[in-house]
């Protein structure tokens, strides 16, 4: 499974699209900025095995895909960029799922990953709640876009786990 290279390439393309999607100056949104508490500490001290890294990455990308697939999201972003971004995420999910199939011979206790998956889900719940509280305002979406860019950048740390053989 040659995931690191393909994933890095898709990740960079997704980041570029995400950067282009901005429709409002972040400098006009300073009052709306928010701390979403990305679960960095939980990931930082952990040496991820390949299958663990894949499942956590999958969860992050799946949650991002869900977030940008809503009706409210469609109204917030330029349609062609949003479609390209969603396609890039969908391809990443496919790559990860194909990799899981190849790694199927590797035994791993599912419980090992539950804490990390739960942390990711709670993080995205906080993002969704923030958008709801801010009534999906343009600035709220801009703040979320900046946050997702950061979480995407952080996923490069997870990819280190993909380079190790179990």
């Amino acid at each position: 499974c040659d995931l690191p290279q393909t994933h890095s390439l898709r990740n960079r393309r997704a980041l570029i699209l995400l950067a282009q999607m901005g429709r409002i100056s972040p400098f006009s949104c300073l009052k709306d900025r928010h701390e979403f508490r990305f679960p960095e500490e939980e990931f930082d001290g952990h040496q991820f095995q390949k299958t663990q890294a894949i499942s956590v990455l999958h969860e992050m990308i799946q949650q991002t895909f869900n977030l940008f697939s809503t009706e409210d999201s469609s109204a917030a972003w330029e349609q062609s960029l949003l479609e390209k971004f969603s396609t890039e995420l969908y391809q990443q999910l496919n790559d990860l799922e194909a990799c899981v199939i190849q790694e199927v011979g590797v035994e791993e206790t599912p419980l090992m990953n539950e804490d990390f998956i739960l942390a990711v889900r709670k993080y995205f719940q906080r993002i969704t709640l923030y958008l709801m509280e801010k009534k999906y305002s343009p600035c709220a979406w801009e703040v979320v876009r900046a946050e997702i860019m950061r979480s995407f950048s952080f996923s490069t740390n997870l990819k280190k786990g993909l380079r190790r053989k179990d």
């Epitope: 972040p26 979403f36 860019m149």
Partner: antibody, heavy 123, light 112 residues
Framework: EVQLQQSGGDLVKPGGSLKLSCAAS????????MSWVRQTPDKRLDWVSI????????YYPDSVKGRFTISRDNAKNTLYLQMSSLKSEDTAMYYC????????????????WGQGTSVTVSS | DIVMTQAAFSNPVTLGTSASISCRSS???????????LYWYLQKPGQSPQLLIY???NLASGVPDRFSSSGSGIDFTLRISRVEAEDVGAYYC?????????FGSGTKLEIK
């Protein structure tokens, strides 16, 4: 290793123009916001301009608005500051700085700085 | 604009003892999101400024834990627990709460 290599500083006459450059290496330049900060002869730090990672949005304090233009070329990993209608009070050491990845909390901490380039405006 | 006020010089300190540097802002830097957008930078002689502290109390990468920072929304203190010769320089506080971002005038750390 993150590096910001600056160039373009010079002695110019009042009313003149100058373009400063800041070549970035050791990180994904297109993912980071950037700023220019100047240090006046009395050693005060004065924030001059900021640009978003994609280059679409900029902001300037009133002291330089309309005279200075910040821009970037992500393909060349380079940040620029075009200065025109220069005044004697623009005399300073100019630093480019990278903004830390703040995410939704918009933390604009300047985590890496260039070595500085000197601009002197005098007749 | 938010004005950041600092004394020009610190009280002279002996190497190995602790030092405190103060900063005051003209407006509270505590955002409704719970973050205090106060930063400390150190400029050593002949060098570019370097980030020491972000969001009032967080140590920047590579900064020794001899440095710490605290404060209310308006009054802030940078502490150095055991001053070393390499700590000499000008310490600047800054705010990123509002545009334009502003810096204090800097405090020079004086060694006895």
């Amino acid at each position: 290793e993150v590096q910001l290599q600056q160039s373009g500083g010079d002695l110019v006459k009042p009313g003149g123009s100058l373009k400063l450059s800041c070549a970035a290496s050791g990180f994904t330049f297109s993912s980071y916001g950037m700023s220019w900060v100047r240090q006046t002869p009395d050693k005060r730090l004065d924030w001059v301009s900021i640009i978003t990672s994609g280059g679409s949005y900029t902001y300037y304090p009133d002291s330089v608005k309309g005279r200075f233009t910040i821009s970037r070329d992500n393909a060349k990993n380079t940040l620029y500051l075009q200065m025109s209608s220069l005044k004697s009070e623009d005399t300073a050491m100019y630093y480019c700085a990278r903004h830390a990845e703040g995410g939704g909390n918009y933390d604009y901490a300047m985590d890496y700085w260039g070595q500085g380039t000197s601009v002197t405006v005098s007749s | 604009d938010i004005v950041m006020t600092q004394a020009a010089f610190s009280n002279p300190v002996t190497l190995g003892t602790s030092a405190s540097i103060s900063c005051r802002s003209s407006k509270s830097l505590l955002h409704s999101n719970g973050i205090t957008y106060l930063y400390w930078y150190l400029q050593k002689p002949g060098q570019s400024p370097q980030l020491l502290i972000y969001q009032m109390s967080n140590l920047a990468s590579g900064v020794p834990d001899r440095f710490s920072s605290s404060g209310s929304g308006i009054d802030f203190t940078l502490r150095i627990s055991r001053v070393e010769a390499e700590d000499v320089g000008a310490y600047y506080c800054a705010q990123n709460l509002e545009l334009p971002f502003t810096f204090g005038s800097g405090t020079k750390l004086e060694i006895k």
